[in-house]
Amino acid sequence: QPDAINAPVTCCYNFTNRKISVQRLASYRRITSSKCPKEAVIFKTIVAKEICADPKQKWVQDSMDHLDKQTQTPKT
């Protein structure tokens, strides 16, 4: 779970070691602050849980791609 040490900076100290079904994921944000020990992705699930994940892992990249495509507005 992400940890806000000194708001508004949120950091991840541990990553989930299991894949989360992409269908459970609602959105994500990248953590790139130099105040944090490591770069991370925080996924928010459809039931509003927040999960820290390793952006180097393929499933994390696939999930971000999937969410990006899902949020793209169709061309008119």
Partner: antibody, heavy 119, light 113 residues
């Protein structure tokens, strides 16, 4: 294609414990989320618990809290469900079921393990 | 917990006739951002594990005959067998996978009249 194979039928005395196993092939446990569902004779399907990657832990249905333990051995891609303090009402077929990364629903099921509790 | 309620409990239909099963959830299982209903339908024949028929409330699994269809959204769902065949005799269950604990309807037994 994921395949799920369960251990064989068991007969137990009331008060005893039973441990049922479920082995996955065609994938690994780290790719899946394994759950247990039971069905008493002539009754419906009842979710007992399973690994919830959103919480990073195994979660249990309230009805079974304290009496059921679900564990996994990632080296053999096998999950276990142990139910203690057995009573006659626990006589049922126990299924393991799993979803993969792209689905989120139970798309693979084991063949079922009949557990009979009788003195 | 989300409670799933099916009706009827049992249903006898003539061969070739339509069978309709409804499933109601006590809370919505629709996630509005992706417009997906987190609901599946299973078919269970005697002595067998459940077989997934439909996911996302209306998407037929590969290999499932097109006489099976799912519809509905939010809290009200329907499974329809447009022309009942002898091999469709089974118990049918809905299940939500929106939020844990995952919950099933009580089942609907479909028989031949």
């Amino acid at each position: 294609q994921v395949q799920v194979v369960q251990s064989g039928a068991e007969v137990k005395n009331p008060g005893a414990s039973v441990k049922v196993s479920c082995k996955v092939s065609g994938s690994t446990l780290t790719e899946l989320s394994m759950h247990w569902v039971r069905q008493a004779p002539g009754k419906g399907l009842e979710w007992m618990g399973g690994f919830d990657p959103e919480d990073g832990e195994t979660i249990y249905a309230q009805k079974f809290q304290g009496r059921v333990t679900m564990t996994e051995d990632t080296s053999t891609d096998t999950v276990y469900m142990e139910l203690s303090s057995l009573r006659s009402e626990d006589t049922a077929v126990y299924y393991c079921a799993t979803n993969d990364f792209w689905s989120g629903y139970f798309d693979y099921w084991g063949q079922g393990t009949l557990v009979t509790v009788s003195s | 917990d989300i409670v799933m309620t099916q009706s009827p409990d049992s249903l006898a239909v003539s061969l070739g006739e339509r069978a309709t099963i409804t499933c109601k959830s006590s809370q919505t299982v629709l996630y509005s951002s992706n417009n997906k209903n987190y609901l599946v339908w299973y078919q269970q024949k005697s002595g067998q594990p459940p077989k997934l028929l439909i996911h996302w409330a209306s998407i037929r699994e590969s290999g499932v005959p097109d006489r099976f269809s799912g519809s509905g959204s939010g809290t009200d769902f329907t499974l329809t067998i447009s022309s009942l065949q002898a091999e469709d005799v089974a118990v049918y269950y809905c299940q939500q996978y929106y939020s844990s604990p995952w919950t099933f309807g009580q089942g609907t037994k479909v028989e031949i009249k």
